[in-house]
Interface confidence: low
């Protein structure tokens, strides 16, 4: 499994990995205590024919080509968790590890 | 988790799983033995404000709103194999578990 | 083998619009991005944009963005290339080219396939 | 917009001899260089990408060097072919920009 890593000079228009930073403050999430920020990063561009396509299936329904169906598009396909220290809905501290908050991979599907 | 199944008559526009059953022999892929067919779903629908958001992420990239970001997509979020009897590319036949070919989750990512 | 085929040479007035085609052929055509590039008489290359035929989506250079629309017709494998308001220093030849990706990461690819080019003379 | 200098605008040379074309870049564009051959009346065709890398089919004579924003074609030993305008291509940031190009004639 492969992506491509852009950034905001890029010229790439297929689906890249772009950089981005959370900024909890930023929202208003003051529940959340550390970190105040971290390296979300995102998913953007066109999935072209076959490109990326992180599984057989994606190409069969392009090749099928039911009613409705939009085409691939760009998502994470491959993503990691977080250490964060936060209030729960009960005012009680918690530190867990909060999965799928980070995009290290982007794909076709 | 959970995810919305449809059919050709249903009047959901969110994101939902159709089902799809791919003829191979229609697509002229004569080096698959077995099956010829097989119920592979495919997933199609507006992914609305946090409607099945699989990941957090996603609704925090909704917040940050870079440039480029196209808001989630209606995308599998989980999928099974099949096993399948073809011929690889040297003549041999093969008799294999292929990986991620049955949806069996829509999901907005 | 791939090959773009574009229309005929074309005489306009200025203010006029013309719309050149490239007919493609031997590749999937929605694959693909197809680029537009001008060169005047006896001058230099300039990039006028590109359109991907699988939706149409299409990036501009700012100097025509305001006179330009690339379109695509899927079912005949052509992309077209209209240019709105013409002036006599849009007289030129106007080629269509295949972008070609050869990796896997940003900016890796390379124009493979030409068109034979388009004369397009603006005069009164 | 990206600036691409190129150098020199024009350039005599005999059948035999080897010559470089260079290219300047207004602002690091990684390796993001593509060179082509242009011909009186023909399309332009694609002779390196990626600075350095040869597209399929193009004689080894034919070959590209730099990165960031310094890049150069060499031929080398020049064919009667060999004869023609040649351009630099920055594909790193749209707008994409062409160098001016250089002519190559026959001395």
């Known amino acids: 499994d492969f992506g491509l890593d852009c950034d905001e000079h890029s010229t790439e228009s297929r689906c890249c990995r772009y950089p981005l930073t959370v900024d909890f403050e930023a929202f208003g999430w003051d529940w959340i205590i550390a970190p105040k920020r971290y390296k979300a990063n995102y998913c953007s561009g066109e999935c072209e024919f076959v490109f990326l396509q992180k599984y057989p299936h994606t190409h069969l329904v392009h090749q099928a080509n039911p009613r409705g169906s939009a085409g691939p598009c760009c998502t994470p396909t491959k993503m990691s968790p977080i250490n964060m220290l936060y209030f729960n809905g009960k005012e009680q501290i918690i530190y867990g590890k909060i999965p799928a908050m980070v995009v290290d991979r982007c794909g076709c599907s | 988790d959970f995810g919305l199944d449809c059919d050709e008559h249903s009047t959901e526009s969110r994101c939902c799983r159709y089902p799809l059953t791919v003829d191979f022999e229609a697509f002229g892929w004569d080096w698959i033995i077995a099956p010829k067919r097989y119920k592979a779903n495919y997933c199609s629908g507006e992914c609305e404000f946090v409607f099945l958001q699989k990941y957090p992420h996603t609704h925090l990239v909704h917040q940050a709103n870079p440039r480029g970001s196209a808001g989630p997509c209606c995308t599998p979020t989980k999928m099974s194999p099949i096993n399948m009897l073809y011929f690889n590319g040297k003549e041999q036949i093969i008799y294999g578990k292929i990986p991620a070919m049955v949806v069996d989750r829509c999901g907005c990512s | 083998q791939v090959q773009l085929v574009q229309s005929g040479a074309e005489v306009k007035k200025p203010g006029a619009s013309v719309k050149v085609s490239c007919k493609a052929s031997g590749y999937t055509f929605t694959g693909y991005f197809m680029h537009w590039v001008r060169q005047a008489p006896g001058q230099g290359l300039e990039w006028m944009g590109n359109i991907y035929p699988y939706n149409g989506v299409s990036n501009y250079n700012q100097r025509f963005k305001a006179r330009v629309t690339m379109t695509t017709d899927t079912s005949t494998s052509t992309a077209y290339m209209e240019l709105r308001s013409l002036r006599s220093d849009d007289t030129a030849v106007y080629y269509c080219?295949?972008?070609?990706?050869?990796?896997?990461?940003?900016?890796?690819?390379?124009?493979?396939?030409w068109g034979q080019g388009t004369l397009v003379t603006v005069s009164s | 917009d990206i600036q691409m200098t190129q150098s020199p605008s024009s350039l005599s040379a005999s059948v035999g001899d080897r010559v470089t074309i260079t290219c300047k870049a207004s602002q690091d564009i990684n390796s993001y260089l593509s060179w082509f051959q242009q011909k009186p009346g023909k399309a332009p065709k694609s002779l390196i990408y990626r600075a350095n890398r040869l597209v399929d089919g193009v004689p080894s004579k034919f070959s590209g060097s730099g990165s960031g924003t310094d890049f150069t074609l060499t031929i080398s030993s020049l064919q009667p072919e060999d004869f023609a305008t040649y351009y630099c291509?920055?594909?790193?940031?749209?707008?994409?920009?062409f160098g001016a190009g250089t002519k190559l004639e026959i001395k």
């Open positions: 291509l920055q594909c790193d940031e749209f707008p994409l920009t």
């Open positions: 080219a295949r972008r070609y990706y050869y990796g896997t990461g940003p900016a890796d690819w390379y124009f493979d396939v």
